[in-house]
């Protein structure tokens, strides 16, 4: 009888260990990626930033994948996504073709199954950066709550990439899972 | 036999109550701190803001500590940190020392063990606040996901503190724990 | 005896199913509401934006209610609230009434029990949108962590609604529950 009870308890314990694991949401996915500002291509009004750090400084990733410049979702869920993008220019950096700048960020989602890209969030500002001032700076922050499916990819596009602030505290994006999909 | 079963069940119940508590992450820490307008430093230089409300209006704190102008982490974990900083100037307040302003926020982390300070997030903008307009306003928002250890301290530095908007809906910062460290 | 053990186990299982449900925070409430561009008020005055999508594109809602232009809380808790508001103007849209603009957002909470409205968060900027540039753009992002009670309502007010960017990736607000109230 005692043996039987232990077996029953083991079943209970086992099922609740599973539940406990699930209550931690399979080790809740997250990522915080900081800019690697080397070798950003040009040629379009907005360019995709493909080089980010995920394993140094503030950069980190867990239960998500970073590949080919994209943050890949490994686990279905609702995620809070965010991005902080800083632009700057100093007179010693050379001139600007125009004082009127469009400083923008676009957080996009790509589905591999249906090869299409959609903008989830955008932000930014048109700025008048006059040569009368030796230094200019501007930051954008966007954030929002989105349903993401395994295999979907998040990427960051910006205008004027040559003006990006390359500091890890300045230009970054990230995600963390908040809850499962019902 | 029945007594023995109850004892077994109590053991199961006990362990799961612990698990339940842990699944609530020991009452998940958070803080939302609003600016204390009576104690804003003057000047245009970069300063640490040390006076915040944690127990009135929107200000609140739980399982974190506020001391000496710093938000102290009591529980290891991954936290979402955020700050919203508003600057404003009205012509009735007198002239600005310069029309070219650098309005910035820096969210910093200090480790007591290794007495060093690191900027986690920065944001802001250079602004030209001309005398042609009677009122000027600008807000910065930053947010990001960071690993914080017990004893580490979060503080806020700004430039031009004398231009801060003292409203609780304008100038605040906060944190909430999202998940444990594996 | 074996029957009795099963009954005991069922009790354990039942109570833990409740706990499991609770550990999912009764299906954690959230909302992400995107602007309904067909119904944006005109003018430059401060207005409440009452028309949002909750069931198309990125718009979604769960365990919260959207009614009369307000996001209604159904479940007590601590929530992270956010808003992203984009303003834009192209010269082809005609002249602006003034080049000096105040582009602002206010996230407000209304309690029906005590019929009063309070601003939780505000952000924005004064802008000089000169005719020398053909296009102007500006985005605001605010976010913060707030205690919300069932029945309380969240709404968005902006200045210069006629300048709002009607894209779903541009102008939106949302909320997600992070934890219970102790």
């Amino acid at each position: 009888g005692s043996q039987h009870i232990r077996a029953e308890k083991a079943m209970v314990d086992g099922s609740w260990l599973d539940l406990a694991k699930r209550s931690k949401l399979e080790a809740q996915p997250f990522a915080h990626l900081t800019i690697n500002a080397t070798d950003i291509p040009s040629g379009s009004h907005k360019v995709s930033l493909s080089s980010w750090y995920h394993d140094r400084g503030w950069g980190k990733i867990s239960n998500m994948t970073f590949s080919n410049g994209k943050l890949i979702v490994n686990q279905d869920g609702f995620y809070y996504l965010y991005a902080n993008i800083c632009f700057r220019h100093h007179e010693t950096s050379g001139d600007l073709a125009t004082e009127y700048l469009q400083l923008m960020v676009y957080v996009t989602k790509t589905s591999i199954k249906i090869p299409s890209s959609h903008t989830l969030m955008k932000g930014g500002s048109t700025k008048y950066w006059s040569g009368n001032s030796e230094f200019h700076f501007y930051s954008i922050n966007v954030g929002g709550f989105f349903k993401l499916r395994s295999g979907e990819e998040i990427s960051i596009e910006v205008s004027n990439p040559s003006l990006l602030d390359p500091d890890q505290d300045a230009t970054y994006f990230g995600a963390f899972k908040v809850r499962d999909i019902d | 036999g029945s007594q023995h079963i109850r004892a077994e069940k109590a053991m199961v119940d006990g362990s799961w109550l612990d698990l339940a508590k842990r699944s609530k992450l020991e009452a998940q820490p958070f803080a939302h701190l609003t600016i204390n307008a009576t104690d804003i430093p003057s000047g245009s230089h970069k300063v640490s803001l040390s006076s915040w409300y944690h127990d009135r209006g929107w200000g609140k704190i739980s399982n974190m500590t506020f001391s000496n102008g710093k938000l102290i982490v009591n529980q290891d974990g991954f936290y979402y940190l955020y700050a919203n900083i508003c600057f404003r100037h009205h012509e009735t307040s007198g002239d600005l020392a310069t029309e070219y302003l650098q309005l910035m926020v820096y969210v910093t982390k200090t480790s007591i063990k290794i007495p060093s300070s690191h900027t986690l997030m920065k944001g802001g903008s250079t602004k030209y606040w001309s005398g042609n307009s009677e009122f000027h306003f600008y807000s910065i928002n930053v947010g990001g996901f960071f690993k914080l250890r017990s004893g580490e301290e979060i503080s806020i530095e700004v430039s031009n503190p004398s231009l801060l908007d003292p409203d609780q809906d304008a100038t605040y910062f906060g944190a909430f724990k999202v998940r444990d460290i594996d | 005896g074996s029957q009795h053990i099963r009954a005991e186990k069922a009790m354990v299982d039942g109570s833990w199913l409740d706990l499991a449900k609770r550990s999912k925070l009764e299906a954690q409430p959230f909302a992400h509401l995107t602007i309904n561009a067909t119904d944006i008020p005109s003018g430059s005055h401060k207005v409440s934006l009452s028309s949002w999508y909750h069931d198309r594109g990125w718009g979604k809602i769960s365990n919260m209610t959207f009614s009369n232009g307000k996001l209604i809380v159904n479940q007590d808790g601590f929530y992270y609230l956010y808003a992203n508001i984009c303003f834009r103007h192209h010269e082809t849209s005609g002249d602006l009434a003034t080049e000096y603009l105040q582009l602002m957002v206010y996230v407000t909470k209304t309690s029906i029990k005590i019929p009063s409205s309070h601003t939780l968060m505000k952000g924005g900027s004064t802008k000089y949108w000169s005719g020398n540039s053909e296009f102007h753009f500006y985005s605001i992002n605010v976010g913060g962590f707030f205690k919300l009670r069932s029945g309380e309502e969240i709404s968005i007010e902006v200045s210069n609604p006629s300048l709002l960017d009607p894209d779903q990736d541009a102008t939106y607000f949302g909320a997600f529950k992070v934890r219970d109230i102790d």
């Epitope: 291509p41 040009s42 040629g43 073709a97 125009t98 040569g131 004027n160 040559s162 003006l163 | - | -």
Partner: antibody, heavy 123, light 107 residues
């Protein structure tokens, strides 16, 4: 039709000064950065000066820094290059060119060129 | 300064042949490279921007490729009107610099 027409080229002695002009038409002059590019007798191209659309940024290579000044008058749709302390190595065909970019305002390619004006520095 | 080296200095071809012109940068310039054509007694004309983007009004036989330090301008089936000098120019870093040019002449 988008057009740039340079004028003011001449024969000048070393140490002398000269002012070149470039009249722009067919596009909104005030919305573009502008540059001067010269072509030396050995057919090499050298960027000489740039000015931003609003005229607040100017830049020069080390070879002409302090001697050349680029300016613009958007009301007259005209670009200028004031050259002083001229040297024999400044002898070249001077082209006025419209500066353009797609991605970053720090970029620069020249999508419209004038026919050029000849500057000869010789004693 | 970023030095652009073009090769060959001169290329003799017969009309109808296809050719490749090289431009090498002294340091990585990503894709911030542009190509110009200059016919005898004319001003330069923009052909390709950002290494590979064609310009409106330029014949499709002109194409560009490359990234980093090595770039190529290709002309598929050269026509008589294509003879002249070809220059590359970088806009990755200040000051903007041009290559020495490749002269395409009739064989």
């Amino acid at each position: 039709e988008v057009q740039l027409v340079e004028s003011g080229g001449d024969l000048v002695k070393p140490g002398g000064s000269l002012k070149l002009s470039c009249a722009a038409s067919g596009f909104t002059f005030s919305r573009y950065g502008m540059s001067w590019v010269r072509q030396t007798p050995d057919k090499r191209l050298e960027w000489v000066a740039s000015i931003s659309s609003g005229g607040t940024y100017t830049s020069y290579p080390d070879s002409v820094q302090g001697r050349f000044t680029i300016t613009r008058d958007s009301a007259k749709n005209t670009l200028y290059l004031q050259m002083s302390s001229l040297k024999s190595e400044d002898t070249a065909m001077y082209y006025c060119a419209r500066r353009n970019f797609i991605t970053s305002a720090t970029d620069c390619y020249f999508d419209v060129w004038g026919a050029g004006t000849t500057v000869t520095v010789s004693s | 300064d970023t030095v652009l080296t073009q090769s060959p200095a001169t290329l003799s071809v017969t009309p109808g042949a296809s050719v490749s012109l090289s431009c090498r940068a002294s340091q990585s310039i990503s894709n911030n490279l542009h190509w110009y054509q200059q016919k005898s007694h004319e001003s330069p004309r923009l052909l390709i921007i950002y290494a590979s983007q064609s310009i409106s009004g330029i014949p499709s036989r002109f194409s560009g490729s490359g990234s980093g330090t090595d770039f190529t301008l290709s002309i598929n089936s050269v026509e008589t009107e294509d003879f002249g000098v070809y220059f590359c120019q970088q806009s990755n870093s200040w000051p903007f610099t041009f290559g020495g040019g490749t002269k395409l002449e009739i064989k």
